[in-house]
């Protein structure tokens, strides 16, 4: 923390301008009035302050707004945003997409994923839901940021907004996030024809249940291997060899390369070797012919 001193009369600050770059840290602390700083935040970003000087300005604002900055200040943080921690941002209430855009631009090229994730979270809370304008802003200014939201926050996405989400926006989404998004996507695209539906739903399929994957296998979709590998293990395991063959079409030839990787490896272990042999790929590890499979989990559940 900066030690407190009194401000020399000749150093008194009446407006935020470039002369402040010549102030030492303790002079800034003593001479800049926090209320003046807050009122003239729009000038700060145009002034080439050092990171040390920005620390002092942040300290001033923290003292003035211990419960969190108002949006009028947040909107004009500029490079001061780089000094914020997720804990600082968690105190904010942000509703303006202009504020979000401004801070996303500042954060570009800096390691600020935790801060950006928290900021987006505050915007969703502030706006009440993840509406189309917010999704459009995220996809335009922060590809992949959608996946920084928690499943709870993503649950506020209305199905009507799903169409604005591009495949690349979902690249970093985990299974729990796709579990939330998939049913919304299914609803959003339900009136589309088979092939058009598959193109749209494909990026969300990491959240699809077995019955939906089975249904796709009846529709001649020719799912590519990359999409198949992103399916939930639980959704793949119950599929039969015939269903996988129908689902993948010519892409089934790619199973050989993925033989040792989940979910293919786990799926192979659940298939009869005879059935696997029909794929013509030399896949090994299936249940030997003549073996009986007892599902002990059923008996345990009954006892």
């Amino acid at each position: 923390d900066v030690e407190r001193t009194t401000c020399p009369p000749e150093k008194e600050v009446h407006e935020i301008d470039e002369s402040l770059i010549f102030y030492k840290k303790r002079e800034l602390e003593a001479c800049v009035d926090a209320a003046l700083l807050a009122a003239q935040m729009d000038r700060v970003d145009a002034i080439p302050f050092t990171y040390e000087q920005l620390d002092v300005l942040k300290h001033k604002l923290d003292e003035l707004y211990p419960q969190g900055y108002p949006e009028s200040v947040i909107r004009h943080l500029g490079h001061l945003f780089l000094k914020m921690s997720p804990e600082d941002i968690r105190k904010w209430n942000v509703t303006s997409l202009e504020t979000l855009k401004a801070l996303l631009k500042v954060s570009k090229g800096h390691e600020m994923s935790a801060q950006v994730a928290t900021l987006i979270d505050r915007v969703v809370v502030g706006r009440g839901q993840l509406d189309k304008d917010t999704v459009d802003t995220l996809t335009a200014f922060c590809p992949g940021c959608l996946c920084s939201l928690s499943p709870e926050r993503l649950s506020s996405v209305p199905p009507s907004v799903i169409g604005a989400v591009r495949p690349q926006d979902l690249d970093t989404c985990g299974p729990r996030q796709l579990d939330v998004l998939y049913p919304k996507a299914r609803l959003a695209f339900q009136n589309m024809s088979g092939s058009e539906y598959f193109v749209k739903i494909r990026p969300f399929l990491g959240g699809a249940p077995t019955e939906d994957v089975k249904a796709l296998s009846q529709q001649n979709v020719s799912m590519d291997l990359a999409t198949f590998m992103k399916l939930r293990r639980e959704a793949v395991l119950p599929l039969t060899v015939a269903e996988v063959q129908k689902l993948l079409g010519p892409h089934v030839e790619g199973l050989k390369v993925e033989e040792q990787h989940s979910p293919v490896r786990d799926w192979i272990l659940k298939q009869r070797q005879d059935d696997l042999d029909t794929l013509g790929l030399g896949l090994q590890g299936g249940i030997p012919n003549g073996y009986l499979i007892l599902d002990l989990s059923v008996r345990e559940a009954l006892s």
Epitope: D224, L225, Q245, P250, H251, V252, E253, G254, K256, V257, D277, T278, L279, G280, L281, G282
Partner: antibody, heavy 121, light 107 residues
Framework: EVQLVQSGAEVKKPGASVKVSCKAS????????MHWVRQAPGQGLEWMGN????????YYNERFRSRVTMTVDKSTSTAYMELSSLRSEDTAVYYC??????????????WGQGTTVTVSS | DIQMTQSPSSLSASVGDRVTITCKAS??????IAWYQHKPGKAPKLLIH???ELQPGVPSRFSGSGSGRDYTFTISSLQPEDIATYYC?????????FGGGTKVEIK
């Protein structure tokens, strides 16, 4: 040693059909799909399609779908490619090729010696 | 289907010259490209797979590079026995496609 030995050259009339064979040895026939590639005079290599040797399910290049039939005989480890309604543009060398599944869908590491098919009236 | 655009369609170079052939895919093929040498009356011969992996027994003057949609095949010092047509093959999709070929001749 892996070998793909193809049938001999054929001369056919327009409208006729030709059936080219490819006998595989030196590996487990049912562990690798068989592909067919052709090269017409002055043209490049063209992938025609492939077949699962275990249960005979083929996938064809759209360009040949209406005229090509790929089959296998597991008992003799032989793949066949039949092309019907032949025209002069089908004059080409036809190759069978076996993929190596090292990455993605596999590249071709073994080829037959080629079968020349001439279509002429 | 993925289209492969290969250039040039033919080239003439002197022995010892560096020769470069390019293939451009119609979409990202994630380095799943192989290069073949094809001589008249012979089956195509695999030289390189996965963009830059040299097949055993293939001379080190042959090399490959690239990523995304753009790929390059290079012969660092052309030899008389390198006279042939060279093809790229994409195998990022099960429906394989070849480039149009490049005929390499000696000046």
């Amino acid at each position: 040693e892996v070998q793909l030995v193809q049938s001999g050259a054929e001369v056919k009339k327009p409208g006729a059909s030709v059936k080219v064979s490819c006998k595989a040895s030196g590996y487990t026939f049912t562990n690798y799909w068989m592909h067919w590639v052709r090269q017409a005079p002055g043209q490049g290599l063209e992938w025609m399609g492939n077949i699962n040797p275990s249960q005979g399910g083929p996938y064809y290049n759209e360009r040949f779908r209406s005229r090509v039939t790929m089959t296998v005989d597991k008992s003799t480890s032989t793949a066949y490619m039949e092309l019907s309604s032949l025209r002069s543009e089908d004059t080409a060398v036809y190759y069978c090729a076996r993929p190596y599944y090292g990455s993605s869908y596999g590249y071709f590491d073994y080829w037959g010696q080629g079968t020349t098919v001439t279509v002429s009236s | 289907d993925i289209q492969m655009t290969q250039s040039p369609s033919s080239l003439s170079a002197s022995v010892g010259d560096r020769v470069t052939i390019t293939c451009k895919a119609s979409q990202d093929i994630n380095k799943y490209i192989a290069w073949y040498q094809h001589k008249p009356g012979k089956a195509p011969k695999l030289l390189i797979h996965y963009t830059s992996e040299l097949q055993p027994g293939v001379p080190s003057r042959f090399s490959g590079s690239g990523s995304g949609r753009d790929y390059t095949f290079t012969i660092s010092s052309l030899q008389p026995e390198d006279i042939a047509t060279y093809y790229c093959l994409q195998y990022a999709n099960p429906l394989r496609t070849f480039g149009g070929g490049t005929k390499v001749e000696i000046k």
